[in-house]
């Protein structure tokens, strides 16, 4: 009898362990990716940034995948996505080709199943970076809450990539799962 | 027999109560700190802001500590950190000594065990605030997802502190725990 | 005896199912509302934006209500609130009435019980949008962690609404519940 009760308890224990693990916060996917400045494209055109760190300094990833410059969702859910992009120029880097700049970021979602790319968030500013000043700086921050499905990919596009600030505290993006899909 | 079963059930109940409490959202640390303008330093140099409210208006804190101008982590975890910093100047507030300004924020983490300070996030802009305009305003927002250990401290550094907007809706920073460390 | 044990187990199972459901992430309220550009007010004055999508494109809502231009809280809790507001102007849209602009956003909370409205977050910038440039753009992002009670309403006010970017990736606001109130 006592043995049978223990078996029942183990069943209760076991089933609840699964449920508890699922409901616990430790399995929630996240990523914080920081710019890899060794491979920033040049030019002033809009480009997709493909080189990011995922495992050094502040960069980290769990239950998501980073591949081919894209952050891949492994687990359906609602995620908070964010990006911080810093642009800078010092006169010692040479003259700017133009003083009128569009400094922009686009956070895009690509679905493999239905090959398509959509912009989730954008931000930025037009700037007049005059030659009268020896140093210029500008940062953009965007963030929002989105439904993401397994296999979908998040990527970052910017204008004027050659002006990106390469510091890990300056140019980064990330995501963390907040909630399951009902 | 029935008594024994109840004892078993109580054991199950008890152990699960602990687990559930841990997995429930109500014990998650958070803080939202708003600027205390009675003690903003002057100057144009970069300074650490040490005066923040934690218990009035929108300001609040739970399972974290505010001490000596720093937000102290009491519980290991992954946290979303954010800061909103507003700068403003009206011509009645005094004449600007320069039109070329660097308006910046740095969110830093200090580890007591290994005495070191590192910038987690930065943002801002160089601005040209001409005397031709009677009012100037600029806001910075930064946010990101970071692993924080108990005892680590978060602080805010800004340039040009005398230009800070002292409103609680303007200049604030905060954190909330999203996830345990595996 | 075995039947009795199963009943005990069912009781344990049942009570824990409730607790687990409560502690699980799937019941957490959220909203991501995108601008409805068919009804943006004109002018340069500060206005409350009342037209938002809640069920098309990236817009979505769960366990919160959208009514009369306001996001209504249905469940007490601590929420992360955010807004991204983009302003833009192209010379083909006609000349600006003034080159000196205040481009601002205010995230406000209204309590019905005690009729009052308070600004939770603000952001923006004064801008000089010269006629020398054919296109101008500027984005604001704000975010913060706030205690919200059932029945309270969140709304968005902006200056210069006629300059708003009507894209769903540009102008939006949202909220998600992070934690219960103790």
């Amino acid at each position: 009898g006592s043995q049978h009760i223990r078996a029942e308890k183990a069943m209760v224990d076991g089933s609840w362990l699964d449920l508890a693990k699922r409901s616990k916060l430790e399995a929630q996917p996240f990523a914080h990716l920081t710019i890899n400045a060794t491979d920033i494209p040049s030019g002033s055109h809009k480009v997709s940034l493909s080189s990011w760190y995922h495992d050094r300094g502040w960069a980290k990833i769990s239950n998501m995948t980073f591949s081919n410059g894209k952050l891949i969702v492994n687990q359906d859910g609602f995620y908070y996505l964010y990006a911080n992009i810093c642009f800078r120029h010092h006169e010692t880097s040479g003259d700017l080709a133009t003083e009128y700049l569009q400094l922009m970021v686009y956070v895009t979602k690509t679905s493999i199943k239905i090959p398509s790319s959509h912009t989730l968030m954008k931000g930025g500013s037009t700037k007049y970076w005059s030659g009268n000043s020896e140093f210029h700086f500008y940062s953009i921050n965007v963030g929002g809450f989105f439904k993401l499905r397994s296999g979908e990919e998040i990527s970052i596009e910017v204008s004027n990539p050659s002006l990106l600030d390469p510091d890990q505290d300056a140019t980064y993006f990330g995501a963390f799962k907040v909630r399951d899909i009902d | 027999g029935s008594q024994h079963i109840r004892a078993e059930k109580a054991m199950v109940d008890g152990s699960w109560l602990d687990l559930a409490k841990r997995s429930k959202l109500e014990a998650q640390p958070f803080a939202h700190l708003t600027i205390n303008a009675t003690d903003i330093p002057s100057g144009s140099h970069k300074v650490s802001l040490s005066s923040w409210y934690h218990d009035r208006g929108w300001a609040k804190i739970s399972n974290m500590t505010f001490s000596n101008g720093k937000l102290i982590v009491n519980q290991d975890g992954f946290y979303y950190l954010y800061a909103n910093i507003c700068f403003r100047h009206h011509e009645t507030s005094g004449d600007l000594a320069t039109e070329y300004l660097q308006l910046m924020v740095y969110v830093t983490k200090t580890s007591i065990k290994i005495p070191s300070s590192h910038t987690l996030m930065k943002g801002g802009s160089t601005k040209y605030w001409s005397g031709n305009s009677e009012f100037h305003f600029y806001s910075i927002n930064v946010g990101g997802f970071f692993k924080l250990r108990s005892g680590e401290e978060i602080s805010i550094e800004v340039s040009n502190p005398s230009l800070l907007d002292p409103d609680q809706d303007a200049t604030y920073f905060g954190a909330f725990k999203v996830r345990d460390i595996d | 005896g075995s039947q009795h044990i199963r009943a005990e187990k069912a009781m344990v199972d049942g009570s824990w199912l409730d607790l687990a459901k409560r502690s699980k992430l799937e019941a957490q309220p959220f909203a991501h509302l995108t601008i409805n550009a068919t009804d943006i007010p004109s002018g340069s004055h500060k206005v409350s934006l009342s037209s938002w999508y809640h069920d098309r494109g990236w817009a979505k809502i769960s366990n919160m209500t959208f009514s009369n231009g306001k996001l209504i809280v249905n469940q007490d809790g601590f929420y992360y609130l955010y807004a991204n507001i983009c302003f833009r102007h192209h010379e083909t849209s006609g000349d600006l009435a003034t080159e000196y602009l205040q481009l601002m956003v205010y995230v406000t909370k209204t309590s019905i019980k005690i009729p009052s409205s308070h600004t939770l977050m603000k952001g923006g910038s004064t801008k000089y949008w010269s006629g020398n440039s054919e296109f101008h753009f500027y984005s604001i992002n704000v975010g913060g962690f706030f205690k919200l009670r059932s029945g309270e309403e969140i709304s968005i006010e902006v200056s210069n609404p006629s300059l708003l970017d009507p894209d769903q990736d540009a102008t939006y606001f949202g909220a998600f519940k992070v934690r219960d109130i103790d």
Epitope: - | G43, S44, D95, Y100, G131, N132 | -
Partner: antibody, heavy 122, light 108 residues
């Protein structure tokens, strides 16, 4: 050592004009805001005008707005005050003074030049 | 504009005595941004104190400043013969920058 040396003062009739100069040395002139402060005989001090380091922004006391113009030539390390439509009440010793450069807002005055006397009289 | 009123107009003291000079503002000075100057006859003013209480370079520690809001004080702990002069307060927390009318410290 920081030095400021004013010149250009003298006697002028009401409605007349005068241009004051202030030669600066001992510091990076273009990096500092500068001001003019005056002191009527036997009276207190009155701030007159200020200018940013780049010269891009200028500020004036209401009593001189529209009549006085502050300017600077950073290549010559010189500050100027062009005074037009002078009145008897503009009679004073005019000092040029350096902003400390430690704050983004123009603040105290340190150091001061020795001053130049402007007398407006018929 | 912020009006600064200094008192007394004249202070007659002997060397070695303590001098207390007052400066009252018509409204609170933002961030307590106040400075004090000393001016001797025929000379330009000299900065003594800035930021209410910070001594300028080369100023002896017998000069000290205090106060906040609308009421500020310059104290000379022990008057030396070279200290007798006119003293001005100046605020720079609001535009335009303004001065008090001065307090003359004379030898009794």
């Amino acid at each position: 050592e920081v030095q400021l040396l004013e010149s250009g003062g003298g006697l002028v009739q009401p409605g007349g004009s005068l241009r004051l100069s202030c030669a600066a040395s001992g510091f990076t002139f273009s990096s500092y805001a500068m001001s003019w402060v005056r002191q009527a005989p036997g009276k207190g001090l009155e701030w007159v005008s200020g200018i940013t380091g780049s010269g891009g922004s200028t500020y004036y006391a209401d009593s001189v707005k529209g009549r006085f113009t502050i300017s600077r030539d950073n290549s010559k390390n010189t500050l100027y005050l062009q005074m037009n439509s002078l009145r008897a009440e503009d009679t004073a010793v005019y000092y040029c003074a350096k902003d400390p450069g430690t704050t983004v807002i123009m603040s105290w005055f340190d150091p001061w030049g020795q001053g130049t006397l402007v007398t407006v009289s018929s | 504009e912020i009006v600064l009123t200094q008192s007394p107009g004249t202070l007659s003291l002997s060397p070695g005595e303590r001098a207390t000079l007052s400066c009252r503002a018509s409204q609170a000075i933002p961030y307590n941004q106040l400075a004090w100057y000393q001016q001797k006859p025929g000379q330009a003013p000299r900065l003594l104190i800035y930021g209410v209480s910070s001594r300028a370079t080369g100023i002896p520690d017998r000069f000290s400043g205090s106060g906040s809001g609308t009421d500020f004080t310059l104290t000379i702990s022990r008057l030396e013969p070279e200290d007798f002069a006119v003293f001005y307060c100046q605020q720079y927390g609001s535009s335009p920058r303004t001065f008090g009318q001065g307090t003359k410290v004379e030898i009794k």
